[in-house]
Amino acid sequence: GSERTCCPVNWVEHERSCYWFSRSGKAWADADNYCRLEDAHLVVVTSWEEQKFVQHHIGPVNTWMGLHDQNGPWKWVDGTDYETGFKNWRPEQPDDWYGHGLGGGEDCAHFTDDGRWNDDVCQRPYRWVCETELDKASQEPPLL
């Protein structure tokens, strides 16, 4: 495939990545799949500046990111190391709360109204953010 040099229509460029901000809600797995179908992934936050950039665009609205612990430890969807990476959890979070009555705990991370993160039930229909790196090779065949 060819290397992507500019962002697709309706995506926003920032620091060599492209971002797409949903205006509807989906469960985490559906949001994750949506991004994959766009040759992207749910947003992976690696710095204070990226956190602030995303916050600026989503406003005070619950929004999924590419972080989950559905298989045990917390993991970023693109393989970025969680333990050594940027974190911005709300106080007392993540708490894997079981008291919601929906079955199980809370395995998916989202931005809250103040931008800090919370873990929640993955089935909740929150907005989401897709991200793809500009330097990444596109899956589309090169134009002849």
Epitope: W48, E49, K52, F53, Q55, H56, P60, F86, K87, N88, W89, P91, D113, D114, G115, R116
Partner: antibody
Framework: QVQLVESGGGVVQPGRSLRLSCAAS????????MHWVRQAPGKGLEWVAV????????YYADSVKGRFTISRDNSKNTLYLQMNSLRAEDTAVYYC????????????WGQGTLVTVSS | DIQMTQSPSSLSASVGDRVTITCRAS??????LNWYQQKPGKAPKLLIF???SLQSGVPSRFSGSGSGTDFTLTISSLQPEDFATYYC?????????FGPGTKVDFK
């Protein structure tokens, strides 16, 4: 009401150390990031450091990196600034300030404590 | 690091005047721009956060505008208690940085 009270300032010789404290009350201290900001006599404001609500992350101004350490004790509702290898240019009034979590602005400030580095 | 500049560095005005102070960032800071007022011997006081949001308890004669790199603080009708120094600050990127300040004094 929100109250922040700094202490620990004074006169210290170059190369020596000093620890500032900031006692917080009137809000849930453990839920807020905190900042140190300083102001040299007759000069403008200079941001020094920030610490996450749980102490898990910290950032510093280049001018103090490697010499100053920001920390907190949430059980005591207290913020600290450990200042080592002090220089004359560190002479300033040091303010602690509470961070608004969404915008990171400093919404409440202490009255400040004066640190004078002089031989 | 992001550099913040302010203009003017000082201005002389009279009670009732409309006062405008500008702040410029060396790169895009979106709306992560705050304005503070400081009087001699006192701690700074937050006036405006997120470029245009008025802090609780601050008189409505203060307003902020702008996004990206260019921002403005406006005092619609200067009052005696408004003579002070005003600072802008960016909180988009660490290290956070302040502008050099604008001193507003009596004409």
């Amino acid at each position: 009401q929100v109250q922040l009270v700094e202490s620990g300032g004074g006169v210290v010789q170059p190369g020596r150390s000093l620890r500032l404290s900031c006692a917080a009350s009137g809000f849930t201290f453990s839920s807020y990031g905190m900042h140190w900001v300083r102001q040299a006599p007759g000069k403008g404001l200079e941001w020094v450091a920030v610490i996450w609500h749980d102490g898990s992350d910290k950032y510093y101004a280049d001018s103090v990196k490697g010499r100053f350490t920001i920390s907190r004790d949430n059980s005591k509702n207290t913020l600290y600034l450990q200042m080592n290898s002090l220089r004359a240019e560190d002479t300033a009034v040091y303010y602690c300030a509470r961070e608004d979590p969404r915008t990171s602005c400093s919404d409440y400030w202490g009255q400040g404590t004066l640190v004078t580095v002089s031989s | 690091d992001i550099q913040m500049t302010q203009s003017p560095s000082s201005l002389s005005a009279s009670v009732g005047d409309r006062v405008t102070i500008t702040c410029r960032a060396s790169q895009n800071i979106f709306s992560y721009l705050n304005w503070y007022q400081q009087k001699p011997g006192k701690a700074p006081k937050l006036l405006i956060f997120a470029a245009s949001s008025l802090q609780s308890g601050v008189p409505s004669r203060f307003s902020g505008s702008g996004s990206g790199t260019d921002f403005t603080l406006t005092i619609s009708s200067l009052q005696p208690e408004d003579f002070a120094t005003y600072y802008c600050q960016q909180t988009y990127s660490v290290p956070f940085t302040f502008g050099p300040g604008t001193k507003v004094d009596f004409k």
